[in-house]
Amino acid sequence: DCSEDLLCILKRAPFKKSWAYLQVAKHLDKTKLSWNKDGILHGVRYQDGNLVIQFPGLYFIICQLQFLVQCPNNSVDLKLELLINKHIKKQALVTVCESGMQTKHVYQNLSQFLLDYLQVNTTISVNVDTFQYIDTSTFPLENVLSIFLYSNSD
Amino acid sequence: DCSEDLLCILKRAPFKKSWAYLQVAKHLDKTKLSWNKDGILHGVRYQDGNLVIQFPGLYFIICQLQFLVQCPNNSVDLKLELLINKHIKKQALVTVCESGMQTKHVYQNLSQFLLDYLQVNTTISVNVDTFQYIDTSTFPLENVLSIFLYSNSD
Amino acid sequence: DCSEDLLCILKRAPFKKSWAYLQVAKHLDKTKLSWNKDGILHGVRYQDGNLVIQFPGLYFIICQLQFLVQCPNNSVDLKLELLINKHIKKQALVTVCESGMQTKHVYQNLSQFLLDYLQVNTTISVNVDTFQYIDTSTFPLENVLSIFLYSNSD
């Protein structure tokens, strides 16, 4: 305990702040999503579809995607995967078009969060196997990947 | 860098905290939602359906709504819009009653988040096209708008 | 105001950090969910399905569950309840299998968050009446309960 030692307290204090808020790129052509570099980036780098951690610590990560599905004759499973260093860390699934009827369109919104310790140079990415259903036309700003540092490493 | 200068460190430290957690008003009569003033408010004002920012900085904003739809003969698109200064900043949509069958009821839950820099007197509001479907009777406490200041402006 | 008094500033500064990120237990046998103790726990205890608060303050609480439903002939309401000291504080509902058709399976993802002041020894738990539909086999890591202390009590 260093409750009376000012410098000690400050050295251990969680002052560091890092955050990002990126919107999905307009044109998607693969399951690994790409993001617009002109979003909010502070203490985090963006490179080749990845957020790259620059300061170690406990991060809150949240991704939200807006889907628009032209229903085929069968149901469709929409999946959102959060990857840390190319490993699936968390995923969310939802089934749409479950009635099996061909309808004009069906909207669906899917979110995923994670609270995890991340080291320097850790990469965060998002994978969606049905990327063609991500609504980059009607609602391009709704598809986001965001993180913030909750507590930096002591 | 001022790593050994205590006052310098403290002056730059992100101490400021502001937050709000408001539940939707019991009686809704328009697309712009109203909120109960007796929620949690700290460093933020509530006025005419708006949260009004009092300290500039990077805010995490999250809204969650619980819908209850008496399905008509057609599908229904539920929409949640987050507005900053009366401009749509982020929206989420989901389609319910997609089978086109008249059913007793369908529950749906919709969330929306945002991480954004906000200035003093910035207003945050929520708009819902189908406000009549917001479940204020069975689950009135489930419809919430919440924010917290992540990092105050230097 | 103690803007020049270093120790005063530090005593009032929101340095305290507490957090948890727990994944659901593999085998569920009751509506109150159990969690794996080997998750992330810092400044919070886990006991008998409850997170137990050790430091008072304003907490952000978030729970996310992944459901897999073998549709019967009728629609199914999935419900997620967040309980504080055994009292329902917030719940989310979504209806699946709404077409009333027996299908192979339907995925659904449900989230719930809360921002609330919690005292020492406050318990946080999660209740799901249709716990048999929580997907602990295909996607066991997707069902999580997480909290972090946003602002400690002055």
């Epitope: 617009n36 002109d38 979003g39 609504d135 700003l141 | 819009e81 507005l83 401009h87 749509i88 509001s125 | -």
Partner: antibody, heavy 124, light 110 residues
Framework: QVQLQESGPGLVKPSETLSLTCTVS????????WSWIRQPAGKGLEWIGR???????NYNPSLKSRVTISVDTSKNQFSLKLSSMTAADTAVYYC??????????????????WGQGTTVTVSS | QSALTQPASVSGSPGQSITISCTGT?????????VSWYQQHPGKAPKLMIY???NRPSGVSNRFSGSKSGNTASLTISGLQTEDEADYYC??????????FGGGTKLTVL
């Protein structure tokens, strides 16, 4: 500079379906959102609907049951079909460029580029 | 969806200022700052004069200005000129993701 040109029949019989096409020149149709508007003689403007590059649409609720808007990106054209025409549908029909997304914002500029309009008369 | 309410006509002499009002509801004008104004001369297509309540597209004279209070938007034309004589329409984005127009106002320059 983007220019729009409406084309289609000037005369339609009652109960038939109107088909109009709007050709976009000077820019890619995929970069924007597009609307149809009409104006009966001596009356005000009425918004009919819009289409996105994805083919998704929004329609005026009062016309929704009769309207179909489609897009052909390969031809840089979008089209309007209005079924069950009556004399009340006699009007000048305009196509226009709708709101757009730039950077991290939605820009609801309104309808900033219009075609010159085409007159449609419903008569037997 | 109901049309926005505008006065059928207004008039003014050259050099004067006039204001045209546009009243909507809490589902359109009241909730968004997405009000636009159009000028239409006889036999011509409408021309965008104001967007997002008070912004002017490039090429539009600064004599044209817009404002909004509650559910009512306004277009003000200062230093009235003969070429300003035309029909003026307001429009607003709505909660249903549609546009709604006003009934139009005929401006006469005396």
């Amino acid at each position: 500079q983007v220019q729009l040109q409406e084309s289609g029949p000037g005369l339609v019989k009652p109960s038939e379906t109107l088909s109009l096409t709007c050709t976009v020149s000077g820019g890619s149709i995929s970069s924007y959102i597009w609307s149809w508007i009409r104006q009966p003689a001596g009356k005000g403007l009425e918004w009919i609907g819009r289409i996105y590059a994805s083919g998704n649409t929004n329609y005026n609720p009062s016309l929704k049951s009769r309207v179909t808007i489609s897009v052909d990106t390969s031809k840089n054209q979008f089209s309007l079909k209005l079924s069950s025409m009556t004399a009340a549908d006699t009007a000048v029909y305009y196509c226009a460029r709708d709101y757009r997304v730039a950077g991290t914002y939605y820009y609801y500029y309104g309808l900033d580029v219009w075609g010159q309009g085409t007159t449609v008369t419903v008569s037997s | 969806q109901s049309a926005l309410t505008q006065p059928a006509s207004v008039s003014g002499s050259p050099g004067q200022s006039i204001t045209i009002s546009c009243t909507g509801t809490s589902s359109d004008v009241g909730v968004y700052d997405y009000v636009s104004w159009y000028q239409q001369h006889p036999g011509k297509a409408p021309k965008l004069m104001i967007y997002e309540v008070s912004n002017r597209p490039s090429g539009v004279s600064n004599r044209f200005s817009g404002s909004k209070s509650g559910n009512t938007a306004s277009l003000t034309i200062s230093g009235l000129q003969t070429e300003d004589e035309a029909d003026y329409y307001c429009s607003s984005y709505t909660s249903r993701s549609t546009w709604v127009f006003g009934g139009g106002t005929k401006l006469t320059v005396l």
